[in-house]
Amino acid sequence: DIQMTQSPSTLSASVGDRVTITCRASQSINTWLAWYQQKPGKAPKLLMYKASSLESGVPSRFIGSGSGTEFTLTISSLQPDDFATYYCQQYNSDSKMFGQGTKVEVKGTVAAPSVFIFPPSDEQLKSGTASVVCLLNNFYPREAKVQWKVDNALQSGNSQESVTEQDSKDSTYSLSSTLTLSKADYEKHKVYACEVTHQGLSSPVTKSFNRGEC
């Protein structure tokens, strides 16, 4: 199969900026390349076909170019409606492969997360499982690292993260990280902590609680 590689994966920009997204094919696809725009909860919208042909109704600020293995999508002057995820797709071969996507986000100012930790509810513990939640609110940029420690021992493989879409008002993100344990394992330990690293923090922030004391 022909693989499609897009770069960058995220692009931070402001209204009026000229932005360029690159798509590379693992072998020549001539000009059999399409570009799509997708917004959260919506179906992909066809923007461009045959590398540089604009789909009907698509604004002329979208410009496609390239042939062979290297292609670009340029937005000549970014508009508020253009903040979305963009995908390239080859249709040179029957297995029509998509790129992994480029998210065009609003460029914000660095903001440190507010960090909170929540123990499992008594109600949940009755069911035999325990979820500890670490919440990071209103931060920018999106990259944030959460590490879980139980009695100071680093945890791995037993947590899941979920990140919100960018807030339309202040351009920030929020994230929740959930550490899931069995009730039996949860009750074997005392100190539960999440450690957060982010560009807006001069040093990592740790929030913790002692089981049974909150």
């Epitope: 059999w32 399409a34 179906a43 992909p44 066809l46 076909y49 789909e55 249709y91 029509k96």
Partner: nanobody, 121 residues
Framework: QVQLQESGGGLVQAGGSLRLSCAAS????????MSWFRQAPGKEREFVAV????????FYSDSAEGRFTVSRDDAKNTVYLQMNSLKPEDTAVYYC??????????????WGQGTQVTVSS
């Protein structure tokens, strides 16, 4: 306005079967190729199968070949994906899409919202 509505997804055990449907409205599908794609969390959207215009046959991805069958009922304006011998790696949201023109362009101007298929081991 063209609309595509998938249905038939669900939770199934490995080795089991599901039949997905995609009902189209706003466009007569008989002149268009209809495709199925899928997307697993954190992965690219992946081509699964295409039902070309009636009489022109079908094409499958390597992962779908021999296990999945795509068919169409132009009278009902509906395309189907019969999935047999399902594996945990088939877990994904499955989407149908209609070609943007009648000449097998392989570009898609309308997509469904997707139906979740979860295969447990």
């Amino acid at each position: 306005q063209v609309q595509l509505q998938e249905s038939g997804g669900g939770l199934v055990q490995a080795g089991g079967s599901l039949r997905l449907s995609c009902a189209a409205s706003g466009r007569t599908i008989s002149r268009y190729a209809m495709s199925w794609f899928r997307q697993a969390p954190g992965k690219e959207r992946e081509f699964v199968a295409v039902a070309r215009r009636s009489g022109d046959g079908a094409f499958y991805s390597d992962s779908a070949e021999g296990r999945f069958t795509v068919s169409r009922d132009d009278a009902k304006n509906t395309v189907y994906l019969q999935m047999n011998s399902l594996k945990p790696e088939d877990t994904a949201v499955y989407y149908c899409a209609i070609d943007s023109s009648t000449d097998y362009t392989g570009t898609y101007d309308y997509w469904g919202q997707g139906t979740q298929v979860t295969v447990s081991s």
